[in-house]
């Protein structure tokens, strides 16, 4: 006999990175017939929604009109069908950005390199922060963390055409409060390779779209692949 329902999906629209004072909607998708959804923030009940009619609705939205550092943190949701509760969703890390300062992103040896060349990104921010984040735009994008007093190094190692794309970095004042984004740096990887099979170039979204990510405590910043299929359609529309 099943004791719990499958966990719901949780994500943020338009994005998990929210500029301060801007709006964001936290979405929770469970099952049709769910009579109650609960949103938890940092382990405590934050909001409740009871969809009407429950048999016609499998997703609820929790609206935050004015993002600030107090609203940034870890969210999860659960839902109930009858008396049976679901497993909790994955954790969604909601991050407030555009805090304080703007870092500078540079790439060595340069923005245009040869396939196989070792590339390092440098993110610099002179205000008090020790954690930096490097993000690459695009569908198969990911986030790297780096540490340093005023600058972090992000070695990509020998690059292939799969590394082509536009990168930005942030300074992180804590896990959920990030600086303004750096100016973008476009990395071009050129080079004729003989007898070498390289990954294809990433399909990328428009420059103002960052894709959707989840921050899980176990693995750090990571995209939720099941969720991605759902949200990619919205982002591409």
């Amino acid at each position: 006999q099943q004791q719990t329902l499958p966990k719901p999906f949780i994500w943020a629209e338009p994005h998990f990175m929210v500029p301060k004072e801007k709006q964001v909607t936290i979405c929770c998708q469970g099952n049709y017939g769910a009579v109650e959804y609960q949103l938890h923030f940092e382990g405590s009940l934050f909001a409740v929604d009871r969809p009407k009619p429950p048999e016609r609705i499998n997703k609820v939205q929790f609206y935050i009109p004015d993002m600030n550092s107090r609203m940034a943190g870890q969210y999860s949701c659960i839902y109930r069908v009858g008396e049976l509760w679901s497993e909790p969703s994955n954790l969604l890390d909601l991050v407030v950005t555009e805090m304080y300062d703007t870092p500078t992103l540079s790439v060595h040896p340069g923005p245009e390199v040869i396939s196989g060349e070792k590339v390092t990104f440098y993110c610099r921010l002179d205000t008090a922060t020790s954690m930096f984040l490097l993000l690459k735009e695009g569908r198969s994008s990911h986030v790297q963390r780096g540490y340093g007093k005023v600058q972090a190094e992000f070695p990509l190692g020998p690059v292939t055409t799969a590394h082509r794309g536009t990168y930005r970095c942030f300074g992180s004042y804590n896990n959920h409060a990030w600086s303004f984004p750096s100016e973008p740096v476009k990395l071009l990887v050129t080079g004729d390779i003989e007898n070498t099979s390289l990954a294809p170039e990433d399909p990328t979204f428009p420059a103002d779209t960052w894709g959707t990510y989840l921050l899980t405590t176990e693995t750090g910043l990571q995209k939720d692949h099941a969720l991605w299929d759902h949200t990619a359609q919205n982002l591409l529309r």
């Epitope: 040896p109 340069g110 040869i114 196989g116 020998p158 080079g191 070498t196």
Partner: antibody
């Protein structure tokens, strides 16, 4: 210390080919791209192209594409630049240079003279 | 292709004086600009990387500045061994291009 030692001077006939070598020591050869730059008598510096020794990726100045061929032999830490269909205007000193961001180390240069 | 233009073509300065060499890129290259010194019969030698970063073993009298399209190499007090040809180089995009050079000669 890092050293790039190039092969000796060459005198070639128009229409022939020349192959210049550059032996690297003092660093891990496959970790840096090797580039070739030439300098005609009394002229400035002109980039020919570069190669990534670890996977053989190359990038060429369009002006030399099809005539210049860059290769690298990891086992001997040696880079090669072959230039074909030589003409008198190819008379120059040819340098190899390691790209460590900038061209931080250069070979001593190889003089190639093209004359009938 | 990014065209690098150096000025002046020749600069005549007395030893002990200050020398200022200019380099302009045909489009923005951020700070991906490197400076080299070349003496007759020798290979170029790296002086400054990324517009303003000093190089180990290069005397402190050599300094660089600028970003975007306009760059400057300054030699604060010329020594006799500084008279040579100086080249700037675009490190931003392929083809990697050099300026035509500035010849620094004794006045």
């Amino acid at each position: 210390q890092v050293q790039l030692v190039q092969s000796g001077a060459e005198v070639k006939k128009p229409g022939s080919s020349v192959k210049v070598s550059c032996k690297a020591s003092g660093y891990t050869f496959s970790e840096y791209t090797m580039h070739w730059v030439r300098q005609a008598p009394g002229q400035g510096l002109e980039w020919i192209g570069g190669i990534s020794p670890n996977i053989g990726g190359t990038s060429y100045n369009q002006k030399f594409k099809g005539r210049a061929t860059l290769t690298a032999d990891k086992s001997t830490s040696t880079a090669y630049m072959e230039l074909s269909s030589l003409r008198s205007e190819d008379t120059a000193v040819y340098y190899c240079a390691r790209r460590g961001g900038s061209f931080d180390y250069w070979g001593q240069g190889t003089t190639v003279t093209v004359s009938s | 292709e990014i065209v690098m233009t150096q000025s002046p073509a020749t600069l005549s300065v007395s030893p002990g004086e200050r020398a200022t060499l200019s380099c302009r890129a045909s489009q923005s290259i951020s700070d991906y600009l490197h400076w080299y010194q070349q003496k007759p019969g020798q290979a170029p030698r790296l002086l400054i990387k990324y517009a303003s970063q000093s190089i180990s073993g290069i005397p402190a009298r050599f300094s660089g500045s600028g970003s975007g399209t306009d760059f400057t190499l300054t030699i604060s007090s010329l020594e006799p061994e500084d008279f040579a040809v100086y080249y700037c180089q675009n490190g931003h995009s392929f083809p990697l291009t050099f300026g035509q050079g500035t010849k620094l000669e004794i006045k």
